[in-house]
């Protein structure tokens, strides 16, 4: 997270260079329930244009998260070729991407991109500052399709239960065996009539000291 915030400083504030479309995005969004609405606002009216609006993940924009393809006379086409669950909505100077089922590890910086294909000339945007999407999901792992604890959780519970029962049985059996063998040893012992002596001091076993972990050092 900290790295992303630092990386944002690498991008200067938006300036116009030639015939470029300017893009405005929220600096940061938090996805509490694994879903988020990211609005890309353009300095351009898209309504009478054939355009391709896309959302890219990562500082290098390597992952194309979602694409909204629009043509003034046709219905909006929204798709993702990278497995994201996304939808899109068009305003006259904006495209809103609705991302769902986000995972915690998809916390990253996301960039809006716009390309006007028709009529010419071809236009695209000046790179925006991006939006950090911080996914605060309910699940640490990829979220299951159904609510409640996942299958691996139940498997662990069952396996854990079986192992616990097994170890309990083994322990009980061992104790019974040990008590019986001790009793039989006492009955046949040559030292039965000796007076007992006080034993010497027993060695105490201390838990070795483990310094507390500096969790702050692990935060990113």
């Amino acid at each position: 997270m900290l790295r992303l915030l630092l990386a944002l400083n690498l991008f200067p504030s938006i300036q116009v260079t030639g015939n470029k479309i300017l893009v405005k995005q929220s600096p940061m969004l938090v996805a509490y329930d694994n879903a988020v609405n990211l609005s890309c606002k353009y300095s351009y009216n898209l309504f009478s244009r054939e355009f391709r609006a896309s959302l890219h993940k990562g500082l290098d924009s390597a992952v194309e998260v979602c694409v909204v393809y629009g043509n003034y006379s046709q219905q909006l086409q929204v798709y993702s070729k990278t497995g994201f669950n996304c939808d899109g909505k068009l305003g006259n100077e904006s495209v809103t991407f609705y991302l769902q089922n986000l995972y915690v590890n998809q916390t990253d910086i996301y960039f809006c991109k716009i390309e006007v294909m028709y009529p010419p000339p071809y236009l695209d945007n000046e790179k925006s500052n991006g939006t950090i999407i911080h996914v605060k999901g309910k699940h640490l792992c990829p979220s299951p399709l159904f609510p409640g604890p996942s299958k691996p959780f139940w498997v662990l519970v069952v396996v854990g239960g079986v192992l616990a029962c097994y170890s309990l049985l083994v322990t009980v059996a061992f104790i019974i065996f040990w008590v019986r063998s001790k009793r039989s040893r006492l009955l046949h012992s040559d030292y039965m009539n000796m007076t007992p002596r006080r034993p010497g001091p027993t060695r105490k076993h201390y838990q070795p000291y483990a310094p507390p972990r500096d969790f702050a050092a692990y935060r990113s």
């Epitope: 009216n45 309504f47 244009r49 003034y72 006379s73 009529p119 010419p120 000339p121």
Partner: antibody
């Protein structure tokens, strides 16, 4: 200063062809669409089509598809319109106009002075 | 193709008056509309684009309004140089059709 200079008036015979020119100056020629507009005497304006010098792409009004042919010469920053099989219906003033994209809203911001075409035997 | 219905076709008014010219489109053009003024024997000149935005150098007595399929051009306190013909034009997909025009004459 942006200017669109059109070729002079012409008198042509029915059935013949004519080539009208529109020379652009004062801006980057390949960055803007050039349109052609027809206006018959005392009538309104009719959009014929556009030519984009940057890629050579063309868009015609269906009504003029078999009548007009748009071309360009980048070296002289000139767009041409060929009108074929001329009839008296083609007698009109023809304007070229530059299309400006203002943040996704279009307009014809600069116009040529017009070329008067008279088709008569 | 989108049909453009401009009204009135002609208008006879006096200097100082206010006039409104309307343009109706056959479908929603989302404000992709321009207005032009043309004087006799001259080329058209851009007045308004994006339905409401005034082009550079156009006097503030001119104003554009409207949305959807209804648009209008208003000229406050008409000046002698305002007389001529006015045309609307849509840019919602080609062909970029013009309205039939409104001829503004001095009364």
């Amino acid at each position: 200063k942006v200017q669109l200079q059109q070729s002079g008036a012409g008198l042509v015979k029915p059935g013949a062809s004519v080539k009208l020119s529109c020379k652009a100056s004062g801006y980057t020629f390949s960055d803007y669409i050039i349109n052609w507009v027809k206006q018959r005497s005392g009538q309104g304006l009719e959009w014929i089509g556009w030519f984009y010098p940057g890629s050579g792409s063309i868009n015609y009004n269906e009504k003029f598809k078999d009548k007009a042919t748009l071309t360009a010469d980048k070296s002289s920053s000139t767009v041409y319109m060929d009108l074929s099989r001329l009839t008296s219906e083609d007698s009109a003033v023809y304007f070229c106009a530059r299309r400006e994209d203002r943040g996704g809203y279009d307009a014809f911001d600069y116009w040529g002075q017009g070329t008067t075409l008279t088709v008569s035997s | 193709d989108i049909q453009m219905t401009q009204s009135p076709a002609s208008l006879s008014v006096s200097v100082g008056e206010t006039v409104t010219i309307t343009c109706r489109t056959s479908e929603n053009i989302y404000s992709n509309l321009a207005w032009y003024q043309q004087k006799q024997g001259k080329s058209p000149q851009l007045l308004v684009y994006a339905a409401t935005k005034l082009a550079d150098g156009v006097p503030s007595r001119f104003s554009g309004s409207g949305s959807g399929t209804q648009y209008s051009l208003r000229i406050n306190s008409l000046q002698p140089e305002d007389f001529g013909s006015y045309y609307c034009q849509h840019f919602w997909g080609t062909p970029w059709t013009f309205g039939g025009g409104t001829k503004l004459e001095i009364k």
